[in-house]
Every structure is written in structure tokens, then in C-alpha cells.
């Protein structure tokens, strides 16, 4: 009976999310393998988040708008492990907007989700950021490694969206 009611709850939750995401990919997790964590198909999952690589070329504002239409934000990178996971799926000759910007050019960098900007957990390429006119951050491959670079916000780039996993 308990299992039956849990299944019914799950199904109704799935139907609710179906309006926004036509298809979800879910995995069982938790100590009793009773919880399901889901990401929209074809997003990828890492820890408690889902990620989507957008290959359409857009300005930073449009890229954030595009992520938000999908219920997400431009990616906020919190750890080296997270960055390493994300970069597995990126093309080395492309650049991708991050959810990091310096709106006034005062070198006050801020994440789109208001996560505090911690200088000790940043992955800028050597010599970057280097220009107060370049107020948005990208991740790209340079000198044999992935790192961040400041760029002009209005020049179209690919982007990475991130959202919390859906638990049902």
C-alpha cells in the first residue's frame, strides 16, 4: 500500500513536469534506492545538477534568457570537479558563456544565481580577466587546458545551462 501510494505520487509529479520537459531521464538513488533524481533528456547530470550545452550562438543576455526559458541559468561553476565534468562534453575549438559577469566593468564579478564570487575557486586562464570592457566570462580551451576568459557580452557565443535535478 505504501509503495502504491508512492508510485501514484511519482506519476502525478512526472505528469506535472511533463508540461515543461517532454522527456526526463531518471535514476534511482538514496540509501534505500527509493528516491529518483531526474534531468530533462538530453541534459547530463553531475551531483545534484543537470547541464545542457547550447550550441546556438547568442549574446550573454540572450544566452541567459535561453537558459531561463528552459527553467535553468547560465552555469555557475563551484568546484574543479564540476568544471572537469562539464568540459568532457565541450568542443576544444569553441567558447561557451558562463553565468559570470561584471556588469559595470569594475571587476566585481558576480554569478547569476547570486552565489558569492570566491577568488580562490576561479579558473581564469593566465593573464585573465584583462579588460574592464570585457564584462562576461566564457570557458575555452587554451594552452592545453580549459579555463575562463573575459569577453564582450554582446558577441555571440555558445553557452552552458545548469539547473537543479528534479527529485520525484
Amino acid at each position: 500500500n505504501f509503495m502504491y501510494s508512492k508510485t501514484v505520487k511519482r506519476l502525478s509529479k512526472l505528469q506535472e513536469y511533463q508540461q515543461y520537459y517532454p522527456s526526463l531521464t531518471c535514476v534511482m538513488e538514496g540509501k534505500d534506492m527509493e528516491d529518483w533524481s531526474c534531468c530533462p533528456t538530453p541534459w547530463t547530470s553531475f551531483q545534484s545538477s543537470c547541464y545542457f550545452i547550447s550550441t546556438v550562438m547568442q549574446s550573454w543576455t540572450k544566452s541567459q534568457n535561453n537558459c531561463s526559458v528552459m527553467g535553468a541559468d547560465l552555469v555557475v561553476i563551484n568546484t574543479k570537479e564540476e568544471q572537469d565534468f562539464i568540459t568532457q562534453n565541450l568542443k576544444i575549438n569553441s567558447a561557451y558563456f558562463l553565468g559570470l559577469s561584471d556588469p559595470k566593468g569594475w571587476r566585481h564579478w558576480q554569478w547569476v544565481d547570486q552565489t558569492p564570487y570566491n577568488k580562490n575557486v576561479t579558473f581564469w586562464h593566465s593573464g585573465e580577466p584583462n579588460s574592464p570592457d570585457e564584462r562576461c566570462a566564457i570557458i575555452n580551451f587554451r594552452s592545453e587546458e580549459w579555463g575562463w576568459n573575459d569577453v564582450h557580452c554582446h558577441v555571440p557565443q555558445k553557452s552552458i545551462c545548469k539547473m537543479k535535478k528534479i527529485y520525484i
Partner: antibody, heavy 120, light 107 residues
Framework: DVQLQESGPGLVKPSQSLSLTCSVT?????????WNWIRQFPGNKLECMGY???????NYNPSLKDRISITRDTSKNQFFLKLNSVTTEDTATYYC?????????????WGHGTLVTVSA | DIQMTQSPVSLSASVGETVTITCRAS??????LAWYQQKQGKSPQLLVY???SLVDGVPSRFSGSGSGTQYSLKINSLQPEDFGSYYC?????????FGGGTKLEIK
């Protein structure tokens, strides 16, 4: 004030390459924005061909990808269009324009355009 | 690519009249739409960006509106200098495509 000016041959033979130059004054092409080539066919249809960004990266219209190359000479503040294997279908007025104004909401600065005819 | 369908293809009107040109996108372009005016033998001039924002110096008789996939440019009290061709262009995702144009002629 930002000004753009196209130049190049007005007549190109089929199967040859079309080469055009856009000279920019009033703004350094390495300081910002992205720098486009746009063409307008005889029936007035407009097409974005591709661009080069202030930091030198390119993006091309997929319909032209195998034939197009956009490069620049930063010392002369110029950028260039090369279109290979042209046919009569490439007859058009070619414009250069700056992209990225109004948070990339419209092309505010255009050259006057140069007519290129492809004919034997 | 997002396709832009503009109508009408041509339009005849008199000085003082009000005209409306419409543009339909094949997908949601989230208000990232520009309108241009082009006179014979000249390059296009940007009039409106982000669907409804007028470029500095453009007369207030021009106005843009719309959302989603449907947009329009309205010109109130037509002046002789308003005659020419008008084009819409979306700025949502590369490549930015143009509408086919509307030729506005004096009746």
C-alpha cells in the same frame, strides 16, 4: 563616428574567387563588436554571410561554410571576404556591417555596399 | 534556421495615412527583432531594435510591437521621406535572417 567602406572588383568570372575589403574608420576592429558581411541579391533578399569577431574568431552561414573565409588585417583596420567557386547566383550587392550594437539587437552601422556581378 | 515571413510584399499609401507591416518568425524570437528602412541605392538603416525600441533620431511616428513569433511596424501619418523598402530581421540565434521586405510606394 564609425564608418565602413567596401571595395573590390565589380565583375568576377564564374568558378573564380570573389574578394572584398571592408575598411573601418572611427573604431578599432580589435576593440569590440563583430564584423559582418551581408549581401543583397537582385530580388532584394538579404543574407547574413558570416562575421569575424574583435578577437579574431569566425562564424559562417552554414549555407556558405565550404566556400567562405573572413579574415582581417588589424594594422590597417580592415576585414576581408573571400568567396570561392562563385556562380551567377552570387551576383549581389555586398555590404559590411558592425554587429553587437544595442546588446546585439540590430546592425546600426553599414557600409554603402558594392555591387558584384558574376558573369563570363 | 529561423525563417522570417514579411507581409505585405508591397503597399501603396498616401502621405498622412497610417500603415502597418507585419513579420512572422518560424519560432519564438523573444522580442529580438529589428526593423530597417532602405532607400533605392542605399544601405539599410536601423529604425527599431528589440521589437519596440526606437533608434535615436528616428521619428516617433514609427513604432514597433509584438511578441513571440508575431511582430509589426506601424508608421503613423506617412511623410514623403518614409517611402522605400522595409525589412525585419531577427536577432535571437545565429544566423540572423531577414524578412523578404515590404516596398512602400506613394499612391
Amino acid at each position: 563616428d564609425v564608418q565602413l567602406q567596401e571595395s573590390g572588383p565589380g565583375l568576377v568570372k564564374p568558378s573564380q574567387s570573389l574578394s572584398l575589403t571592408c575598411s573601418v574608420t572611427g573604431y578599432s576592429i580589435t576593440s569590440g563588436y563583430y564584423w559582418n558581411w551581408i549581401r543583397q541579391f537582385p530580388g532584394n533578399k538579404l543574407e547574413c554571410m558570416g562575421y569575424i569577431t574583435y578577437d579574431g574568431s569566425n562564424n559562417y552561414n552554414p549555407s556558405l561554410k565550404d566556400r567562405i573565409s573572413i579574415t582581417r588585417d588589424t594594422s590597417k583596420n580592415q576585414f576581408f571576404l573571400k568567396l570561392n567557386s562563385v556562380t551567377t547566383e552570387d551576383t549581389a550587392t555586398y555590404y559590411c556591417a558592425r554587429g553587437g550594437d544595442y546588446d546585439d539587437g540590430g546592425f546600426a552601422y553599414w557600409g554603402h555596399g558594392t555591387l558584384v556581378t558574376v558573369s563570363a | 534556421d529561423i525563417q522570417m515571413t514579411q507581409s505585405p510584399v508591397s503597399l501603396s499609401a498616401s502621405v498622412g495615412e497610417t500603415v502597418t507591416i507585419t513579420c512572422r518568425a518560424s519560432g519564438n524570437i523573444h522580442n529580438y527583432l529589428a526593423w530597417y528602412q532602405q532607400k533605392q541605392g542605399k544601405s539599410p538603416q536601423l529604425l527599431v531594435y528589440n521589437a519596440k525600441s526606437l533608434v535615436d533620431g528616428v521619428p516617433s511616428r514609427f513604432s514597433g510591437s509584438g511578441s513571440g513569433t508575431q511582430y509589426s511596424l506601424k508608421i503613423n501619418s506617412l511623410q514623403p521621406e518614409d517611402f522605400g523598402s522595409y525589412y525585419c530581421q531577427h536577432f535571437w540565434i545565429i544566423p540572423y535572417t531577414f524578412g523578404g521586405g515590404t516596398k512602400l510606394e506613394i499612391k
